[in-house]
């Protein structure tokens, strides 16, 4: 099984634009790395900008489900 | 070990088109960032342009957005950079770089003359 | 985007000599900073990553550190193969930019 872990000092430079860097611990498997990505900003290392109408579109789905 | 090639590079007109390739080896190609940087002579270090070949994310400087396309053809552990519309300003040496926590490998780099 | 001021742009300095170079980024950039050197006519050479962690392979003579705004790069005591062009670069904040370079000559 895997489990997520967060990314030790040298690692976090892997995700960029503020993103949190987790590494997936997998014993089976080499080391991989994800970005929890600040708000305006997506893809693997969150090197892409959200387009602001995408980004209001996502606060108003988040307000109408809570 | 890890090599990275630069190739395609040239003399071109303004306003002419060239497709710089690098070819990557010794490593997992899509689980990288790959990067090209410029370097105009005696000039210093200029980011051009990145893609994650896992997700196809791409950005680019301003100075080159529109022109130039960034690409990867992940079968052939291949990155491409096409240049349109080539100015005199873009006369440099090309280099790719693989990125993991900075840029830890670079290729040979590969001369780019845009001139008439 | 975020500008990356080095400093000196050039200094000359004998073998043996302790080198110190400087870098400030116009915002806060975490420690995504990087430091590179590179030889004429050569493809840069990653020195140090994350602001002060020593790539693989580099001599335990060059040291980094800083974190935020300014950061430095040490050369504890300078041999014939390091006069060459440094350039500090970061990367937490796309795209990423490098510093104008610092020359480092023989005296």
């Known amino acids: 099984t895997s489990h997520l872990v967060k990314c030790a000092e040298k690692e976090k430079t892997f995700c960029v634009n503020g993103g949190e860097c987790f590494m997936v611990k997998d014993l089976s498997n080499p080391s991989r790395y994800l970005c929890k990505c600040q708000p305006g900003f997506t893809g693997a290392r969150c090197t892409e900008n959200v387009p602001m109408k995408v980004q209001n579109q996502e606060k108003a789905e988040e307000l109408y489900q809570k | 070990e890890v090599q990275l090639v630069e190739s395609g590079g040239g003399l071109v007109q303004p306003g002419g088109s060239l497709r710089l390739s690098c070819a990557a080896s010794?490593?997992?190609?899509?689980?990288?960032?790959i990067h090209w940087v410029r370097q105009a002579p005696g000039k210093g270090l200029e980011w051009v342009a990145a893609?994650?070949?896992?997700?196809?994310?791409?950005n680019y400087a301003d100075s080159v957005k529109g022109r130039f396309t960034i690409s990867a053809d992940t079968s052939k552990n291949t990155a491409y950079l096409q240049m349109n519309s080539l100015r005199a300003e873009d006369t440099a040496v090309y280099y790719c770089?693989?990125?993991?926590?900075?840029?830890?490998?670079w290729g040979q780099g590969t001369l780019v003359t845009v001139s008439s | 985007d975020i500008q990356m001021t080095q400093s000196p742009s050039s200094l000359s300095a004998s073998v043996g000599d302790r080198v110190t170079i400087t870098c400030r980024a116009s915002?806060?950039?975490?420690?995504?900073v990087a430091w590179y050197q590179q030889k004429p006519g050569k493809a840069p050479k990653l020195l140090i990553y994350?602001?002060?962690f020593l790539y693989s392979g580099v001599p335990s003579r060059f040291s980094g550190s800083g974190s935020g705004t300014d950061f430095t790069l040490t050369i504890s005591s300078l041999q014939p193969e390091d006069f060459a062009t440094y350039y500090c670069?970061?990367?937490?904040?796309?795209?990423?930019?490098f510093g104008q370079g610092t020359k480092v000559e023989i005296k």
């Open positions: 994350s602001a002060s």
């Open positions: 770089a693989t990125y993991m926590f900075a840029m830890d490998y």
């Open positions: 915002q806060d950039v975490s420690t995504a």
């Open positions: 670069q970061q990367s937490y904040w796309m795209p990423p930019t």
């Open positions: 010794g490593f997992t190609f899509s689980g990288t960032w």
């Open positions: 893609i994650t070949p896992a997700d196809g994310s791409t």
